[in-house]
Each structure stands twice: as C-alpha cells, then as structure tokens.
Amino acid sequence: FERTRSLQDPCSNCPAGTFCDNNRNQICSPCPPNSFSSAGGQRTCDICRQCKGVFRTRKECSSTSNAECDCTPGFHCLGAGCSMCEQDCKQGQELTKKGCKDCCFGTFNDQKRGICRPWTNCSLDGKSVLVNGTKERDVVCGPSPADLSPGASSVTPPAPAREPGHSPQ
C-alpha cells in the first residue's frame, strides 16, 4: 500500500522538516527559516509561533517542531499550549478585571493564581473549627465538640458574612 501510495503521490516521501514544493516538480524542499512541518507529506510548512511580549520562549522552533512559550515572571500560563498569560496575584487574592483583589470574607486562596475558594464547612463532617480561616488559608477542622475532652475547647468560628451568605461552619 505504501509503495502504491508513493507512486501515486510523490509528496508522501517528503519527511518532517520538509514540504512538497509544487513549484519545483514536487521536490521535497526544506522548510524555510521560521517555519516547520511536524509530519511527513505536507505541502506547506507552518509558521513558527513567536513568543513575544509577556510570552517567553521555552523551546525554540525547529524544522520539525513548533516553538513553545511560557510566561515571564509575574504571569502564568492559561489555555492549551499556554495560549494566554495571566497576571499572578498574591496569596489571599484573586484576579478580576480590576486587577488583583483580596478574597471576600469566607474565602481563601493559597496560590498566586486561580480564584478564591470558600473555607471548608467543618460541620459537614460533624467537626468543629480548630483554626480560623484567613484570606490565605483554609480553616482547620478538628474533632466535634462532643469528642473534646473536658476542659478542651475549639475556636469559635467568625460570624458568617451577610453579603453574600456564607454557610456557617
């Protein structure tokens, strides 16, 4: 089958890193600078991705593979193949259109990216709050009040926010 295909389509012989040049009797020509072909039998080479601005080059383009980008310090990748760079925030913040914004009461973010998440609802597991949550850290759940030995006590959770209504812990 391969031999038949080769006889019918001379382009199938062109390896990755080349293209089948119709202007030159379908000779396999090397990809021009700043272009690549990652598979054989291609009639054109693809233009290399350029990592500009907030993007920086993680892997240079070669004749057989595209360039790969990541983000400059202070930014992180989003999307397939790092299609976007998004600004980092501090722990205890999340990114909005206005920029980095402190987590709302009842939420936390322990990373420089992503969104603020609610504190764990300890009562769901029949536990109580051992350590209060902050903007940067989740609450720490401890044994339920009934499990505590005499004299021991757990931290009283802060009053839930009114707007929006965060569930009591």
Epitope: L78, E86, E94, L95, T96, K97, K98, K101, C104, G106, T107, G114, I115, C116, R117, P118, W119, T120, N121, L124, D138, E163, P164, H166, S167
Partner: antibody, heavy 121, light 111 residues
C-alpha cells in the same frame, strides 16, 4: 466532553421540599464552582447560590438563605440543591452552571439542561 | 449594589445589524467584565461572548461584544442577523466576585 446533567421535572405541594441533582462529567468536579440559577416562567435569570465541591463551602443569595441547601457528593461528581418551604412563586426552571477558575468575575461556561419545578396545590 | 439594565425587546430585519445594550447603574463599566448568553425557548443559556469581547469556540464571528465608558454600557452586536438568532439575550456581571448579577434580558425579534 464537559457535561452537567440534571434530574427530571418535579411537581410539589406548597410547604414541601424539592431536591434537584446536577451530575458533572468530563472535568475535575472538585476544582470548579457550581452555581445554581433559576428562571421563573417568562422571567429572567436569578442567582440562588453556589458551592465549591472540593470542600463543601457554600454561598447563598440573601433571598434564599435558610431555605436553600447545597451539597456535593464527590464520589459521584454530583451537586444537589434542596429548596424547602416551597411556595407557588418558586415555580421555575432551576439550572446548575459551572464557573471557570481563571478569574473571580468569570462567566458560566457550561450549564445543565434545567429542571422544571412546579409548585401547585 | 450593581444592577444591569437591558431593553426588553429589540427588532431587526434579516441581514441587518442588531445591537443590544446592557447599562451599568453604578461604578465604571470598564471595571467589570460583562458576559452575554443566548437563550432559546425551552433551552439552557449558551455563552455567546465572555469577558467583554471574547467569543467561545463555535460562536459565529457575527457576534461581538464591546463597551462604552461614556454611556457606562456594554453592547452585544449581531451583524448580518439571521432567523436563528431570534432568542432572549442576557448580560451578566458581578456585584462581588461571588455574587453574579444578570440583566433582565432582551428579546431579539427577527422581522
């Protein structure tokens, strides 16, 4: 493929409760907010509240505090919304929706097909 | 608190351009992401525009989003309107990063 599949239509009596489910597939259930939104017949969209399935943390719209309860079962990737003390004005289509984790003011990228809850005596 | 106001209805002939307005009552529209959903009868909403002007995969280029600080409004523009574009359209933003706010919806009628 990301999907949110909701439970079927319900007819309830005033004063009773309803529990709507939203089964997620095609993504990591614990890493995205699930929002609950409702739409009364011929009306617009109204936020009920939301849950972070990763730890069960919840937020409720002021109008629904004390009446709505959100839970999530991570073993089945299913979120639940229970609404108690039903009245006729709770008749609506109830939607679950997923919010991406890119930014704090992001859109809802996937929605369930909706569950019609009819409250009638 | 944040409120978004939309006209109840917009009518347009096939092939013409429709523009749906979403007006922010307070604050600066430039500080808020606005998202747009299309909803057809008996169906769930579908994202047409997110983060002001971005189009999800599969949404035709006829749909575009923009905003104008002088009128403190966001806009959904549909160029070359087709019969299948007849639907309700909702804008969406946030009061706080937890609390979503929706416009009242605009019914687009294709004459």
């Amino acid at each position: 493929e990301v999907q949110l599949v909701q439970s079927g239509a319900e007819v309830k009596k005033p004063g009773s409760s309803v529990k709507v489910s939203c089964k997620a597939s095609g993504y990591t259930f614990t890493s995205y907010y699930i929002y609950w939104v409702r739409q009364a017949p011929g009306q617009g969209l109204e936020w009920i509240g939301n849950i972070w399935p990763g730890n069960g943390g919840t937020f409720y719209g002021e109008k629904f505090m004390g009446r709505a309860t959100f839970t999530a079962d991570t073993s089945t990737s299913t979120a639940y919304m229970e609404l108690s003390s039903l009245r006729s004005e709770d008749t609506a289509v109830y939607y679950c929706a997923r919010r991406p984790d890119y930014s704090g003011d992001d859109y809802f990228d996937y929605w369930g097909q909706g569950t019609l809850v009819t409250v009638s005596s | 608190s944040v409120e978004l106001t939309q006209p109840p209805s917009v009518s347009v002939s096939p092939g013409q351009t429709a523009r749906i307005t979403c007006k922010l009552n307070s604050g600066n529209i430039g500080s808020y992401y606005v998202h747009w959903y299309q909803q057809k009868p008996g169906q769930a909403p579908v994202t047409m525009i997110y983060r002001d002007d971005k189009r999800p995969d599969g949404i035709p280029e006829r749909f575009s989003g923009s905003s104008d600080s002088s009128s403190n409004s966001a806009f959904l523009t549909i160029s070359g309107v087709q019969a299948e574009d007849e639907a309700d359209y909702y804008c969406h933003s946030y009061d706080s990063t937890i609390t979503p706010v929706f416009g009242g919806g605009t019914k687009l009628t294709v004459l």
